[in-house]
Interface confidence: medium
Amino acid sequence: TEVKVTQPEKSVSVAAGDSTILNCTVTSLLPVGPIRWYRGVGQSRLLIYSFTGEHFPRIRNVSDTTKRNNMDFSIRISNVTPEDAGTYYCVKFQRGSSEPDTEIQSGGGTEVYVLAK
């Protein structure tokens, strides 16, 4: 069966300077390939976090994704700023051998509202 990516929150509100968690789980780790978080859609979408080892300031994974069979790819964004407002998507990719990774499934998106402190 096809992997399913779930983002249960439709929206979260967070005060500027605080941190927030964006929840995402998958039903399967197959096919092999990374999970990435983006803000926005289409040409304007911005890579926010990738579960592939790179360092992303202010953002970290919530659960230990190195553990076998971990299906939780939630992230915590700390010190939120107004520029962080937008819709965040958790996206599953299939790893390509020579070609680029292929996007196979996206969560429904979580809108982040940033409130003035």
């Epitope: 929150e9 439709k10 789980t25 429904g108």
Partner: antibody, heavy 119, light 108 residues
């Protein structure tokens, strides 16, 4: 106070059409996703369809896909359900339900309107 | 699609007794579960969300617990107005949103 008032129900023959309306008041209608949920006589609740606040995102239950169309007019604070090719198994009370703004559970419901499909 | 199974189908109890209703999910829904009460001829009313948080205006004799696939709604001391049908609903999975089949709490 949130109010959801359904109308448009009635008796209709199989294969015919009907349009339900749900008039909303007491909240910023365009900011909320709204749903239709139905209940056949003596049975449980069955989710039918959902439409996002902007109208851009729509989902249907498999049982009504291709026959029912959900829509909304935010200028009139009204939700609609166009029901075509009606079947006996569509007989139910149809409720309009407002979702919570963060999650997909229902914090406000209308009183319901009865649709009876019978020849 | 996540299937919710409620048990028992009917619970016959007397006023003042404790009612324990069960809802089991076919796959984990974490704590994304709501409970509703429905009286004859009325629309459902939200009781519990997030598996254990009471909705506004709901008396504290109603409590919810559980996570993952096993959930419980408890009414600590049944009042006459509590005799009704109770439904659980998961909102973790993407639509279709699903309800349990309901548990009727009736007067013994």
């Amino acid at each position: 106070e949130v109010q959801l008032v359904e109308s448009g129900g009635g008796v209709v023959q199989p294969g015919r059409s009907l349009r339900l309306s749900c008039a909303a008041s007491g909240f910023t209608f365009s900011s909320y996703d709204v749903n239709w949920v139905r209940q056949a006589p003596g049975k449980g609740l069955e989710w039918v369809s959902l439409i996002s606040g902007s109208g851009e995102i729509i989902y249907y239950a498999d049982s009504v896909k291709g026959r029912f169309t959900i829509s909304r007019d935010n200028s009139k604070n009204t939700l609609y359900l166009q029901m075509n090719s009606l079947r006996a198994e569509d007989t139910a009370v149809y409720y309009c339900a407002k979702e919570n703004n963060r999650y997909r559970f229902f914090d406000d419901w209308g009183q319901g309107t009865l649709v009876t499909v019978s020849s | 699609e996540t299937v919710l199974t409620q048990s028992p189908g009917t619970l016959s109890l007397s006023p003042g007794e404790r009612a324990t209703l069960s809802c089991r999910a076919s796959q984990s829904v974490y704590t994304y579960l709501a409970w509703y009460q429905q009286k004859p001829g009325q629309a459902p009313r939200l009781l519990i969300y997030g598996a254990s948080s009471r909705a506004t205006g709901i008396p504290d004799r109603f409590s919810g617990s559980g996570s993952g696939t096993e959930f419980t709604l408890t009414i600590s001391s049944l009042q006459s107005e509590d005799f009704a049908v109770y439904y659980c609903q998961q909102y973790y999975d993407r639509p279709p949103l699903t309800f349990g089949g309901g548990t009727k709490v009736e007067i013994k």
